[in-house]
Interface confidence: low
């Protein structure tokens, strides 16, 4: 990989746990200023594999609320608006980073955590297992 | 909201920037142990709105590598395996948290950042605008 020279203005790293424990500024910088203006908020309803969104709340986590997608049907919606069970609605999952308060209930001490969330659903051709 | 009593064993928060700056343990805890064993890695190919995955690398970001989905077609794949342009393949986007080194090139100082990533694609019915 590329070796980047260390910035001489970095904070002191005398912490005995360094480099496991780092300082993080929670003032979130949002890099999404140039996002596509096309509204994607209604894809959950217009998709051939539509989904509902469920609220997952955990006050010990940052962010404390995450919305999870759950596919509405096992099959996919066909051109007639009916569920076609020859196809499958499946969740698209992504691993995301969150901060977990550690020790619990501490306002300024966290641990990084990876969680798997379902972001939406897609329609796939099923894998058919033929019995010999 | 729920008020949770502060844990008396919390680290000291005398930092003048508190509560904006917090301590974070980078030893990632992975909560995905009970994930569904069904592999979703091939959905990108089996979907009626298939996608390709592109590598986005940034050594100043944690995680440094993020995979971005790009829909292969404007339309969706029909039962005959052809692209049907009466439907649209659209990206499902998710806002995720990442850590950005701040000041740059510092190993132990970060800022939280929100970025928008495309996780996969779904097939939607297009919005048709009728001209009067």
């Amino acid at each position: 990989g590329i070796t980047i020279p260390r910035n001489p203005g970095c904070p002191n790293s005398e912490d005995k746990n360094f480099p496991r424990t780092v300082m993080v500024n929670l003032n979130i910088h949002n890099r999404n200023t140039n996002t596509n203006p096309k509204r994607s908020s209604d894809y959950y309803n217009r998709s051939t594999s539509p989904w509902n969104l469920h609220r997952n709340e955990d006050p010990e986590r940052y962010p404390s609320v995450i919305w999870e997608a759950k596919c509405r049907h096992l099959g996919c919606i066909n051109a007639d608006g009916n569920v076609d069970y020859h196809m499958n609605s499946v969740p698209i999952q992504q691993e995301i980073l969150v901060l977990r308060r550690e020790p619990p209930h501490c306002p300024n001490s966290f641990r990084l955590e990876k969680i798997l969330v379902s972001v939406g659903c897609t329609c796939v051709t099923p894998i058919v297992h033929h019995v010999a | 909201g729920i008020t949770i009593p502060r844990n008396p064993g919390c680290p000291n928060s005398e930092d003048k920037n508190f509560p904006r700056t917090v301590m974070v343990n980078l030893n990632i805890h992975n909560r995905n142990t009970n994930t569904n064993p069904k592999r979703s890695s091939d959905y990108y190919n089996r979907s009626t709105s298939p996608w390709n995955l592109h590598r986005n690398e940034d050594p100043e970001r944690y995680p440094s590598v993020i995979w971005e989905a790009k829909c292969r077609h404007l339309g969706c794949i029909n039962a005959d395996g052809n692209v049907d342009y009466h439907m649209n393949s659209v990206p499902i986007q998710q806002e995720i948290l990442v850590l950005r080194r701040e000041p740059p090139h510092c190993p132990n100082s970060f800022r939280l950042e929100k970025i928008l990533v495309s996780v996969g694609c779904t097939c939607v019915t297009p919005i048709v605008h009728h001209v009067a």
């Epitope: 979130i28 994607s40 908020s41 959950y44 962010p63 609320v65 995450i66 999870e68 972001v119 | 998710q94």
Partner: nanobody, 119 residues
Framework: EVQLVESGGGLVQPGGSLRLSCAAS????????MYWVRQAPGKGLEWVAE????????YYVDSVKGRFTISRDNAKNSLYLQMNGLRAEDTAVYYC????????????WGQGTLVTVSS
């Protein structure tokens, strides 16, 4: 810090009316589209209404068209939802939300206000 605080929910009889309010702070309210979103007990999330930055355009889900009206007062950093002709199926927690809605982190959402329609 972005804050969205809803109020105005409550118990109302079928056919009745309620006006929900959302007080916004921590961001430039007039720069964002705003939304009302609801979640019925045991159900998924449903987008109810959207209003553009200057209030010139409003959009509604079919089930509330002609009954609900979304409005905003940029001078007061406030969003409103006037609900008339309420039905049992309108029972839900109503959230106000900021900006482009993606089912993501909760930076964009309020804590919600419960609307119960029952005789």
């Amino acid at each position: 810090e972005v804050q969205l605080v809803e109020s105005g929910g409550g118990l109302v009889q079928p056919g009745g009316s309620l006006r929900l309010s959302c007080a916004a702070s921590g961001f430039t309210f007039s720069s964002y589209s705003m939304y009302w979103v609801r979640q019925a007990p045991g159900k998924g999330l449903e987008w109810v209404a959207e209003i553009k930055q200057d209030g010139s355009e409003q959009y509604y889900v079919d089930s509330v068209k002609g009954r609900f009206t979304i409005s905003r007062d940029n001078a007061k950093n406030s969003l409103y939802l006037q609900m008339n002709g309420l039905r049992a199926e309108d029972t839900a927690v109503y959230y106000c939300a900021k900006g482009e809605i993606l089912p993501l982190y909760f930076d964009y959402w309020g804590q919600g206000t419960l609307v119960t329609v029952s005789s």
